[in-house]
């Protein structure tokens, strides 16, 4: 028996359902009574889901997995993972034994888009050219860790005096806070871009300083 999975990682958004595709080619006369199907975590060998003895043995993994029972006899051994969490990320092995066996691993990459950044300025009044200001760009509930870029109004990257921190919350999602310290010009725009490297999603925020008032 030859087991086939997708070469590319499966990308799933947090709280959505994901399908880890796995297939095998049944011989003529194949019956489900002959099938032993095991899904397990590749690294720890923890059991995720199984089908053996001619029946679905059910989920051994937080009751959020399911097979496609009607498609098994055609060689579809795919696994449905419901309400994906950050902790589900990793490699899953699909193991099929009939008379002989084969296995293959498929990677699950979990992702969550970052929120539109909110911008704050300190100090936020009585600003004059030449003042040192601190601009904070905050974006929330994304995964995996973000890449943060700052640019001025002309699109020139600002790399000096940038401090970025990323903190994971109880669900494993990251809140990003990036601080730019800059000396004010006569007027100017400062843009923050928060990029999710998996989703290739960019979230933009900017602040424009034109004397008074400030615009965000």
């Amino acid at each position: 028996v030859e087991v086939q999975v997708s070469e590319d990682p499966v990308v799933a958004l947090v709280d959505t359902d994901a399908t880890l595709r796995c297939s095998f080619s049944p011989e003529p006369g194949f019956s489900l009574a002959q099938l032993n199907l095991i899904w397990q975590l590749t690294d720890t060998k923890q059991l995720v889901h199984s089908f053996t003895e001619g029946r679905d043995q059910g989920s051994a993994y937080s009751n959020r997995t399911a097979l496609f029972p009607d498609l098994l006899v055609q060689g579809n051994a795919s696994l449905r993972l419901q309400r994906v969490r950050v902790t589900d990320e990793g490699s899953y092995t699909c193991f099929v034994s009939i008379q002989d066996f084969d296995s293959a691993a498929v990677s699950l990459q979990v992702a969550a888009p970052y929120s539109k950044p909110s911008m704050t300025l300190e100090p936020n009044k009585d600003l004059r050219p030449g003042n040192m200001v601190t601009i904070t760009c905050s974006s929330y509930q994304g995964y995996p860790e973000a890449e943060v870029f700052w640019k001025d109004g002309q699109g020139v990257p600002l790399t000096g005096n940038v401090t970025t921190s990323q903190m994971a919350n109880e669900r494993g999602l990251f809140d990003v806070h990036s601080v730019l310290r800059v000396v004010l010009g006569a007027n100017g725009t400062y843009s923050c871009l928060v990029r999710n490297p998996v989703l290739q999603q960019d979230a933009h925020g900017s602040v424009t300083i034109t004397g008074q008032p400030l615009t965000f």
Epitope: E27, Q34, N36, I38, Q40, K45, L47, S50, T52, E53, Q57, F95, S97, Q99, D100, F101, D102
Partner: antibody, heavy 121, light 107 residues
Framework: QVQLVESGAEVKKPGSSVKVSCKAS????????ISWVRQAPGQGLEWMGR????????NYAQKFQGRVTITADKSTSTAYMELSSLRSEDTAVYYC??????????????WGQGTLITVSS | DIQMTQSPSTLSASVGDRVTITCRAS??????LAWYQQKPGKAPKLLIY???SLQSGVPSRFSGSGSGTEFTLTISSLQPDDFATYYC?????????FGQGTRLEIK
């Protein structure tokens, strides 16, 4: 390279039970199947049953159904075969066996050294 | 249960001989057949699986063929180390069953 090491020889009385252990090392114990095969003196090979340790599910040959219990302890990578209501015909060498390089659970390229169980009054 | 019948039960041959052992299944088993060699006091050793696939490390003088119900194990040129008992085994369906064995002895 998988190694299977079985417990030592035993002499048992008719009607009693015996439990043989098989400790695996050097391979992925929990995912694969461990079978038990016996061989009476001067006789052929006889498959008794198998267990998939990760599932804890065992299959038995009809001949032994109700008399044999195969279990596995994933934490120690050890499989067990218990045979009850022993009779003199159960005198045999008992092997645990495992498929590996042959890509099958049901062909056996790794064997324990064998455990001789003698049933005698 | 699927019955496996080997012939002959005993085979006398000399070093250098080409020998063939036959195994018949009571019903079709496709190619799900293995061959083992066993020496006295030792565990069996897997030679061939899936009717004709040579197990890693087994000398190429051993070969297997057949499908359905009739299978053969051939040793192209007997070596002194080959005198032993040979078993066929089907793994098409439960329960797994073995042939009764063929003892290969020195003539």
């Amino acid at each position: 390279q998988v190694q299977l090491v079985e417990s030592g020889a035993e002499v048992k009385k008719p009607g009693s039970s015996v439990k043989v252990s098989c400790k695996a090392s050097g391979g992925t114990f929990s995912s694969y199947a461990i079978s038990w095969v016996r061989q009476a003196p001067g006789q052929g090979l006889e498959w008794m049953g198998r267990i998939i340790p990760i599932l804890g599910i065992a299959n038995y040959a009809q001949k032994f159904q109700g008399r044999v219990t195969i279990t596995a302890d994933k934490s120690t990578s050890t499989a067990y075969m218990e045979l009850s209501s022993l009779r003199s015909e159960d005198t045999a060498v008992y092997y645990c066996a495992n498929g590996g390089d042959s890509s099958s659970w049901y062909t056996f390229d790794y064997w324990g050294q064998g455990t001789l169980i003698t049933v005698s009054s | 249960d699927i019955q496996m019948t080997q012939s002959p039960s005993t085979l006398s041959a000399s070093v250098g001989d080409r020998v063939t052992i036959t195994c018949r299944a009571s019903e079709t088993i496709s190619s799900w057949l293995a061959w083992y060699q066993q020496k006295p006091g030792k565990a069996p050793k897997l030679l061939i699986y899936k009717a004709s696939s040579l197990q890693s490390g087994v000398p190429s003088r051993f070969s297997g063929s057949g499908s359905g119900t009739e299978f053969t194990l051939t040793i192209s040129s007997l070596q002194p180390d080959d005198f032993a008992t040979y078993y066929c085994q089907q793994y098409y369906s439960y329960p797994i069953t073995f042939g009764q064995g063929t003892r290969l002895e020195i003539k």
